[in-house]
């Protein structure tokens, strides 16, 4: 499965939207920084089968969609930008779902290692827990937004490696 060029463009637009969402000066939020233990090894992608890499990308986008679809998120961010973000993420999920179905099932047998998906889910659970502990404060949301941008940057690198392998 070849990811359409529109997927890369969508990825770039998502990064731009996340950057635009900023609401307060970040310099006030230094003390709220947190180690979410980003699972970098799941994005290094050298040992991955294509199916696994695509599933990891899909999981990141799905979890990001879930995170920004909450009631607390709609209070924290500009509604117009959130709507645009949903649209971009939804389109990327559609792109990836078509690929996941092609790549994951070969001859009726699933070719997936669940560990990578689990690592991504646990990472997002840590993010959600942090927001809860910080009572969804403006700085906590900014820290999370920065963290999501970081994970999307790693996703983009993984995508580029996938494309080079094709």
């Amino acid at each position: 499965c070849d990811l359409p060029q529109t997927h890369s463009l969508g990825h770039r637009r998502t990064m731009m939207l996340l950057a635009q969402m900023r609401r307060i000066s970040l310099f006030s939020c230094l003390k709220d920084r947190h180690d979410f233990r980003f699972p970098q090894e799941e994005f290094d992608g050298n040992q991955f089968q294509k199916a696994e890499a695509i599933s990891v990308l899909h999981e990141v986008i799905q979890q990001t969609f879930n995170l920004f679809s909450t009631k607390d998120s709609s209070v924290a961010w500009d509604e117009r930008l959130l709507d645009k973000l949903y649209t971009e993420l939804y389109q990327q999920l559609n792109d990836l779902e078509a690929c996941v179905m092609q790549e994951v099932w070969v001859g009726g047998t699933p070719l997936m290692n669940e560990d990578s998906i689990l690592a991504v889910r646990k990472y997002f659970q840590r993010i959600t827990l942090y927001l809860t502990e910080k009572k969804y404060s403006p700085c906590a949301w900014e820290v999370v937004r920065a963290e999501i941008m970081r994970s999307f940057s790693s996703s983009r690198n993984l995508q580029e490696r996938l494309r080079r392998k094709e």
Partner: antibody
Framework: EVQLVQSGAEVKKPGESLKISCKGS????????IGWVRQMPGKGLEWMGI????????RYSPSFQGQVTISADKSISTAYLQWSSLKASDTAMYYC??????????????WGQGTLVTVSS | DIQMTQSPSSLSASVGDRVTITCRAS??????LNWYQQKPGKAPKLLIY???SLQSGVPSRFSGSGSGTDFTLTISSLQPEDFATYYC?????????FGQGTKVEIK
């Protein structure tokens, strides 16, 4: 390879203006903040201020507020430190360094080589 | 502003010695503390971040500890290349502030 390359040494007279630069390469320039640090001859490190190149949001140390201006041009991955009217007491080595912003990563992990500014009549 | 106070301001030691430098913050800064090494005519180099995390490429003889207001940088066995000035710096809030430095000299 991550690099911060600063402009060359400057010799100026009191009252003159000056703009020194710090060019980042080998990483996403807008993903990190750039901080500026002063070191006067034989003295310690003093934090002057910091800029987020993604939107040019800036924060200054109270000691340097109004004395200098920090700016950035993300299209050429360059941050600047400028003075409108130099004083002899501005004579120092000036360093730029990158900061991970709100991400959990090492602070000021890469530094420029420094720009020596000498102000003398 | 958060004040950072280092002690001692200078010390003399021999190769192989265990060296300890302390840094105290004027208020709690959790673990938002970094240690840098600077040699004459060179830019500072990050050794330790987040109080105890060793920066990539830094020898394991360097270690950091502490949280809240009191922090320590330890060099377990001083090497000839370790003679330099060491600075602590808080990254808890702006203005970011450095300690005044500790110069480690050859005895």
């Amino acid at each position: 390879e991550v690099q911060l390359v600063q402009s060359g040494a400057e010799v100026k007279k009191p009252g003159e203006s000056l703009k020194i630069s710090c060019k980042g390469s080998g990483y996403s320039f807008t993903s990190y903040w750039i901080g500026w640090v002063r070191q006067m001859p034989g003295k310690g490190l003093e934090w002057m201020g910091i800029i987020d190149p993604s939107d040019s949001d800036t924060r200054y140390s109270p000691s340097f507020q109004g004395q200098v201006t920090i700016s950035a041009d993300k299209s050429i991955s360059t941050a600047y430190l400028q003075w409108s009217s130099l004083k002899a007491s501005d004579t120092a080595m000036y360093y730029c360094a990158r900061h991970p912003g709100l991400n959990w990563a090492p602070d000021f992990d890469y530094w420029g080589q420094g720009t020596l500014v000498t102000v003398s009549s | 502003d958060i004040q950072m106070t280092q002690s001692p301001s200078s010390l003399s030691a021999s190769v192989g010695d265990r060296v300890t430098i302390t840094c105290r913050a004027s208020q709690s800064i959790s673990s938002y503390l970094n240690w840098y090494q600077q040699k004459p005519g060179k830019a500072p180099k990050l050794l330790i971040y987040a109080a105890s995390s060793l920066q990539s490429g830094v020898p394991s003889r360097f270690s950091g500890s502490g949280s809240g207001t009191d922090f320590t940088l330890t060099i377990s066995s001083l090497q000839p290349e370790d003679f330099a000035t060491y600075y602590c710096q808080q990254s808890y809030s702006t203005p970011l502030t450095f300690g005044q430095g500790t110069k480690v000299e050859i005895k």
